[in-house]
């Protein structure tokens, strides 16, 4: 998915991926840090949410996530032995009815409103990373991830493999 | 179709080197992870070593840290596993696999390549 | 490190029979909210094949009569009605942290 080839060979893989269930098959309730341990958080400002990084005061509390995991299917020219490869696939809601979005056109990550079927722009591939990080990448724009840029999440182009351990799109999933 | 074939398996006296290699292709090598696994013979699997897709990070067993040597050539489609003084309880089938997308679990092995450390 | 132990060593059965495999880990393989214990099918002469990955969830191409269940350090991979392809050894492998380690396995032979 990374490197330039590698983004438009791998375009077609996630585009193309089938969520194998419409449940999730587990889901996770924790608090999202950055790399470098900044809380992102999420304020409700004229009835709708904004989503910020900071720092937290000592004793403030984190807010948490709703992490909703699937698994998805992706083409057999991408996987293995011929036949499809599975990936885990994650939609993030830190209050009810409310989902982490990839806005494309504007390069942001913002909080939507749905009703189910999530469309895809809510999906996120999931990626376990070193340094007990994750990093997220979009369904619908393979090789952009979820990423910090000044005190906001956006959506980050990795054009490499080597860029995928950049800082600013790693983040750490805590239940505390 | 996805493929994973490793060669430079051999017998080699205590003490020596050897270098396997995994070809890889019918997937977007640098995307992925990937790793060595080894089987004794008769004897259950053991993971050797680990380097991510951008070879930023390498981990490995301890019993083969200062040793061996896990590298990638993306150019090349191809893994390797440099090895070096060897031991008899290194003689094993050395299987190369790849991570699923995203990095969570070994989805793709290759055949296999028996060493064999023996004097 | 992570020590897996699988049990029984070796499970005789026929074909049609169920079969229960055990995998207790020395303590939880638990994170991010997932199970990361996966289950691998081997037989002689070929690479191992992924089953099961994340405790419960089926790999590419595998057959609706392999199911893994458990959570935190205890996991069963069950087999609801064995065919004679599925005479192998099974080993569960846990992705929580490195080293990532491997179960001795478990042996099901035809009785």
């Known amino acids: 998915a990374f490197g330039i080839s590698g983004v438009q060979k791998y375009t077609r893989a996630l585009h193309d991926s089938s969520i194998t269930g419409i449940s999730p098959i587990t889901e996770y309730l924790a608090s999202l840090s950055t790399y470098n341990d900044q809380s992102i958080t999420f304020a409700l400002e004229d009835e709708s949410y904004e989503i910020y990084v900071e720092d937290l005061k000592k004793d403030e509390k984190k807010d948490k996530v709703l992490l909703s995991y699937y698994e998805s299917q992706h083409p057999s020219n991408e996987s293995g032995d011929g036949v499809d490869g599975k990936m885990l696939m994650v939609t993030l809601s830190p209050t009810k009815d409310f989902w982490l979005h990839a806005n494309n056109k504007e390069h942001s990550v913002e909080l939507h409103k749905c009703e189910k079927p999530l469309p895809d722009q809510a999906f996120f591939v999931l990626h376990n990373m070193h340094s007990n990080c994750v990093s997220f990448e979009c369904k619908t724009d393979p090789g952009v991830f979820i990423g910090v840029k000044d005190n906001h999440l956006a959506l980050i182009k990795v054009d490499s493999s080597e860029n995928l351990c950049t800082e600013n799109i790693l983040f750490k999933l805590s239940e505390t | 179709e996805v493929q994973l074939v490793e060669s430079g398996g051999g017998l080699v006296q205590p003490g020596g080197s050897l270098r396997l290699s995994c070809a890889a292709s019918?997937?977007?090598?640098?995307?992925?992870?990937l790793s060595w696994v080894r089987q004794a013979p008769g004897k259950g699997l053991e993971w050797v070593a680990t380097?991510?897709?951008?070879?930023?990070?390498?981990d490995y067993v301890d019993s083969v840290k200062g040793r061996f040597t896990i590298s990638r050539d993306n150019s090349k489609n191809t893994l390797y596993l440099q090895m070096n003084s060897l031991r008899a309880e290194d003689t094993a089938v050395y299987y190369c696999t790849r991570a699923n997308y995203g990095n969570w679990f070994f989805e793709v092995w290759g055949q296999g390549t028996l060493v064999t450390v023996s004097s | 490190e992570i020590v897996l132990t699988q049990s029984p060593a070796t499970l005789s059965l026929s074909p049609g029979e169920r079969a229960t495999l055990s995998c207790r880990a020395s303590e939880s393989v638990a994170k991010y909210g997932l199970s990361l214990l996966n289950w691998f099918q081997q037989k002689p002469g070929q690479p191992p094949r992924l089953l099961i990955f994340a405790a419960s969830n089926r790999g590419s191409g595998v057959p609706a009569r392999f199911s893994g269940s458990g959570s935190g350090t205890d996991f069963t991979l069950t087999i609801s009605s064995l065919e004679p392809e599925d005479f192998a050894v099974y080993f569960c492998q846990q992705s929580k942290e490195v080293p990532f380690t491997f179960g001795q396995g478990t042996k099901v032979e035809i009785k």
């Open positions: 019918g997937f977007t090598f640098s995307s992925f992870s």
């Open positions: 380097i991510s897709g951008g070879k930023t990070f390498t």
